[in-house]
């Protein structure tokens, strides 16, 4: 067996920079996905976003978000997702449980899945950044 090193003390500006990068990349992904015309958002898919019972940045459901984006990467070769995954990995603990995603098989339904999750991911990163900055403000007052 191996011993983990001393717990990493990460400055809040690093975490904020990661989430800002994710927010920017999420907008790029959504812009790319929205170029596909005639695809509607579906009510059948929900991306887990923030957990109410944890402090930022641990309140971001990073492992689940990663799994959903990995699924999109497999369905549609969006290279921006590679960079998104690398940044999400900065927020994911090594022992975080895996998330299984059921992938749609119908081509049109796949497009709806991609659009829906991309849109929710973009909204989620906006919320995550807000929760980080409001958390930081509360900490200084």
């Amino acid at each position: 067996s191996h011993t983990l090193p001393v717990r990493l003390l990460r400055p809040s500006d690093d975490v904020q920079k990661i989430v800002e990068e994710l927010q920017s990349l999420s907008k790029m992904l959504l812009k790319d996905v929205e170029e596909e015309k005639g695809v509607l958002v579906s009510q059948n898919y929900t991306l887990p976003c923030l957990s109410p019972d944890a402090q930022p940045p641990n309140n971001i459901h990073s492992p689940a978000i990663r799994a959903y984006l990995k699924t999109i990467r497999q369905l549609d070769n969006k290279s921006v997702i590679d960079e998104i995954i690398e940044h999400l990995d900065k927020l994911i603990f090594q022992d975080a449980p895996e998330t299984n995603i059921s992938v749609p098989t119908d081509t049109h339904e796949c497009k709806r899945f991609i659009l829906t999750i991309s849109q929710q991911f973009s909204e989620c990163m906006d919320l995550a950044l807000k929760s980080l900055t409001s958390g930081a403000q509360q900490a200084t007052t």
Epitope: D13, E86, D89, K90, F93, Q94, D95
Partner: antibody
Framework: QVQLVQSGAEVKKPGSSVKVSCKAS????????MQWVRQAPGQGLEWMGA????????RYSQKFKGRVTITADKSTSTAYMELSSLRSEDTAVYYC???????????????WGQGTTVTVSS | AIQMTQSPSSLSASVGDRVTITCRAS??????LAWYQQKPGKVPKLLIY???TSASGVPSRFSGSRSGTDYTLTISSLQPEDVATYYC?????????FGGGTKVEIK
């Protein structure tokens, strides 16, 4: 005790391929990135690519894209780096390395293989 | 790709001297930087990770610091066994490029 053991030295002809293995032991986690680095004689360290063994996700340096393939066999905890269309400039020591830490993303490579010398000569 | 510019490429100092090596990132990489020591014919060894955290078993004379996109490795009192080449590497986004290396010798 975490250990990375690489395959032995290779002598290859120009135009051929080489496949270097890297077996990890004493490490139980699945969420991590392993990297491959090479060092030509008298030169610095050069990043070649990385793999997330848990799902086979890979990243490659633009310089090696199309010539390098990194794979992993979860069942044997072994990663592989294959370099094709070898030329004399590929003569180098090839290293695998991976991190320790609490996050899936690395912030330093704590463990290194012993290195595999690949000589490309006609 | 993010470029890591390391300086100086070589230096010669006396035993007991304070030695500083710098790496400059071409963009903000936060604290995602590591420093390695490589002795001739040996495997690279991690000294510092996350810009300023010492790896296990590393002597206290080695320290890392950051100012914006500039990262510094300091050897507070150079010892004969510190003769080696030192490299930085960033981990912000792939490719995880290395600096060109700094060869440290004893005067």
């Amino acid at each position: 005790q975490v250990q990375l053991v690489q395959s032995g030295a290779e002598v290859k002809k120009p135009g051929s391929s080489v496949k270097v293995s890297c077996k990890a032991s004493g490490y139980t986690r699945t969420r991590y990135w392993m990297q491959w680095v090479r060092q030509a004689p008298g030169q610095g360290l050069e990043w070649m690519g990385a793999i997330y063994p848990g799902e086979g996700d890979t990243r490659y340096s633009q310089k090696f894209k199309g010539r390098v393939t990194i794979t992993a066999d979860k069942s044997t905890s072994t990663a592989y780096m294959e370099l094709s269309s070898l030329r004399s400039e590929d003569t180098a020591v090839y290293y695998c390395a991976f991190p320790e830490g609490q996050y899936a993303a690395p912030y330093g490579m704590h463990y290194w293989g012993q290195g595999t010398t690949v000589t490309v000569s006609s | 790709a993010i470029q890591m510019t390391q300086s100086p490429s070589s230096l010669s100092a006396s035993v007991g001297d304070r030695v500083t090596i710098t790496c400059r990132a071409s963009r903000n990489i936060g604290n995602y930087l590591a420093w390695y020591q490589q002795k001739p014919g040996k495997v690279p060894k991690l000294l510092i990770y996350y810009a300023k955290t010492s790896a296990s078993g590393v002597p206290s004379r080695f320290s890392g610091s950051r100012s914006g996109t500039d990262y510094t490795l300091t050897i507070s009192s150079l010892q004969p066994e510190d003769v080696a080449t030192y490299y930085c590497q960033h981990f912000w986004s792939t490719p995880w490029t290395f600096g060109g290396g700094t060869k440290v010798e004893i005067k």
